[in-house]
C-alpha cells in the first residue's frame, strides 16, 4: 500500500480552514466524495459526504463542516469553521464508495490547532513533497461576531497555496480581494 506523506498546517482556535482538493475529472466526476478524519491514524471516520447527483455542483453542510463539490472544475472544497484544539488531527479528501476502500485524493492534512492570540497569525507551512495534484489551503481568522463562512477574508489573513511548484503566502492587505467562495 502507498503511504502518503502528511502536509502539516498550524492554525489558531476560531479560524476557518478551507482545503481545495483537485480530482481527476475523467475518473471521478460521477463519484461520491468525502472528508474524513483519522482519529487514531489508522481507521477513517467520515465526517461529511457529497450528495447525489454527483455530476452537478452541490454544497453540503454538516455541523462545522461544509463540502462544496464542483465537478466541472474538478474540485472539492472543504471548510471547517470555528476550529478548536480538539479538531487537531489527521484529515483527508477521498473518493467514497463503501464497502470498498476509499481513494485518497492527495496527501493527508495534519491539522494542529492551538490556543493563540486573536490578532497575530503566523502560518507554519511544512511542504513534505510535491505532487501533480496538491491541495490549496486557505486559513481564515474570523472575529466572534462573524457568522458566515463564505465572504471576503478579513485581516489578518494568510492564503497558503502549494500547487506543486512551491509555496505562496499572501498576508494582510494583499489578501483583501481573496474570497472563499468558489
Amino acid at each position: 500500500a502507498i503511504v502518503l506523506e502528511e502536509e502539516r498546517y498550524d492554525l489558531v482556535e476560531g479560524q476557518t480552514l478551507t482545503v481545495k482538493c483537485p480530482f481527476n475529472i475523467m475518473k471521478y466526476a460521477n463519484s461520491q466524495k468525502a472528508w474524513q478524519r483519522l482519529p487514531d491514524g489508522k481507521e477513517p471516520l467520515t465526517l461529511v459526504v457529497t450528495q447525489r447527483p454527483f455530476t452537478r455542483p452541490s454544497e453540503v453542510h454538516m455541523g462545522k463542516f461544509t463540502l462544496k463539490h464542483d465537478p466541472s472544475e474538478a474540485m472539492l472544497q472543504v471548510q471547517m469553521t470555528d476550529l478548536q484544539v480538539t479538531d487537531s488531527g489527521l484529515y483527508r479528501c477521498v473518493i467514497y464508495h463503501p464497502p470498498n476502500d476509499p481513494v485518497v485524493l492527495f496527501h493527508p492534512v495534519r491539522l494542529v490547532v492551538t490556543k493563540g492570540s486573536s490578532d497575530v497569525f503566523t502560518p507554519v507551512i511544512i511542504p513534505i513533497t510535491r505532487l501533480t495534484e496538491r491541495p490549496i489551503l486557505i486559513t481564515t481568522k474570523y472575529s466572534p461576531s462573524d457568522t458566515t463562512t463564505t465572504r471576503s477574508l478579513p485581516k489578518p489573513t494568510a492564503v497558503v497555496s502549494s500547487p506543486g511548484l512551491g509555496v505562496t503566502i499572501i498576508n494582510g492587505t494583499d489578501a483583501d480581494s481573496v474570497s472563499t467562495s468558489s
Epitope: P39, K42, E43, F65, G89, P99
Partner: antibody
Framework: QVQLKESGPGLVQPSQTLSLTCTVS????????VYWFRQPPGKGLEWMGN???????DYNSSLKSRLTLSRDTSKNQVFLKINSLQSEDTATYFC??????????WGQGVVVTVSS | DIVLTQSPALAVSPGQRATLSCRAS??????????MNWYQQKPGQQPKLLIY???NLASGIPTRFSGSGSGTDFTLTIDPVQADDIAAYYC?????????FGGGTKVELK
C-alpha cells in the same frame, strides 16, 4: 458479502495455550481492523486486542503478557493465541470487523471451556 | 478507560415503548460525531449492530429502533416493542481507546 468465522478447540486444559483462527471473506484484512472480544457466561463483552490493517497490534493491558495476535494476509486469516489458560478464560470468543468506529460484522463466536 | 453505565434490566409490555439509557464517564463526541453504538444480542448468538454514531440505523434494522443523545448521555428507543426484541442490549463507545461496552440491559416482557 462480509463474513467472519472463528474456529478452534472447544475444550482446553488449564495452563495450556488456546489458538483460535478468524477466517474473513468479503473484505481484506490489510485494509480493515479486526478485533477480538470475549464474553464469559452470563457476562458482558471484554476487548482482548485488535490487529490493524497495517499489521500493528493493540492489546488489553490485563492480557498483554499472555496474548498474541497475528495474521496471514494470503489466506485472509487472523490468529489469536493466549497462553497459561485458567478457568476464568472460559468464554465465548468473537472476532469482528471495525468500520468507521463501529463493529458492523461479527463472527458467530466459538465457545471455549477451560477445564481438566 | 471510559466506563459506560446501563441499567441491568427493563420489563416492558409488547406494543409499548422501551427506553434504554447509556451514560459515559466522559464525552465520546469527536469532530461533531457521537461515537456511541448500540448492539442487540440474543442468547447463544453474536452481537448485532443496531445503531451507529448515536442515531444512525444500521442496514436491515427495523425502524422501530432509534437512537439519540450526544456527549455523555445516550438513549436507545424501541417503539413498539415486539416479542422478538427480547434480548440484551449493549452500548459501545469508540471515542477513546480502548473501545468499551456497557454492562448491557436485558429487555424482558411484562
Amino acid at each position: 458479502q462480509v463474513q467472519l468465522k472463528e474456529s478452534g478447540p472447544g475444550l482446553v486444559q488449564p495452563s495450556q495455550t488456546l489458538s483460535l483462527t478468524c477466517t474473513v471473506s468479503g473484505f481484506s484484512i490489510t485494509s480493515s481492523n479486526v478485533y477480538w472480544f470475549r464474553q464469559p457466561p452470563g457476562k458482558g463483552l471484554e476487548w482482548m486486542g485488535n490487529i490493524w490493517g497495517d499489521g500493528s497490534t493493540d492489546y488489553n493491558s490485563s492480557l498483554k503478557s499472555r496474548l498474541t495476535l497475528s495474521r496471514d494476509t494470503s489466506k485472509n486469516q487472523v490468529f489469536l493465541k493466549i497462553n497459561s489458560l485458567q478457568s476464568e478464560d472460559t468464554a465465548t470468543y468473537f472476532c469482528t470487523r471495525s468500520w468507521e468506529y463501529y463493529f458492523d460484522h461479527w463472527g458467530q463466536g466459538v465457545v471455549v471451556t477451560v477445564s481438566s | 478507560d471510559i466506563v459506560l453505565t446501563q441499567s441491568p434490566a427493563l420489563a416492558v409490555s409488547p406494543g409499548q415503548r422501551a427506553t434504554l439509557s447509556c451514560r459515559a464517564s466522559q464525552s465520546v463526541t469527536l469532530s461533531n460525531v457521537n461515537l456511541m453504538n448500540w448492539y442487540q444480542q440474543k442468547p447463544g448468538q453474536q452481537p448485532k449492530l443496531l445503531i451507529y454514531h448515536a442515531s444512525n440505523l444500521a442496514s436491515g434494522i427495523p425502524t422501530r429502533f432509534s437512537g439519540s443523545g450526544s456527549g455523555t448521555d445516550f438513549t436507545l428507543t424501541i417503539d413498539p416493542v415486539q416479542a422478538d426484541d427480547i434480548a440484551a442490549y449493549y452500548c459501545q463507545q469508540s471515542g477513546e481507546s480502548p473501545r468499551t461496552f456497557g454492562g448491557g440491559t436485558k429487555v424482558e416482557l411484562k
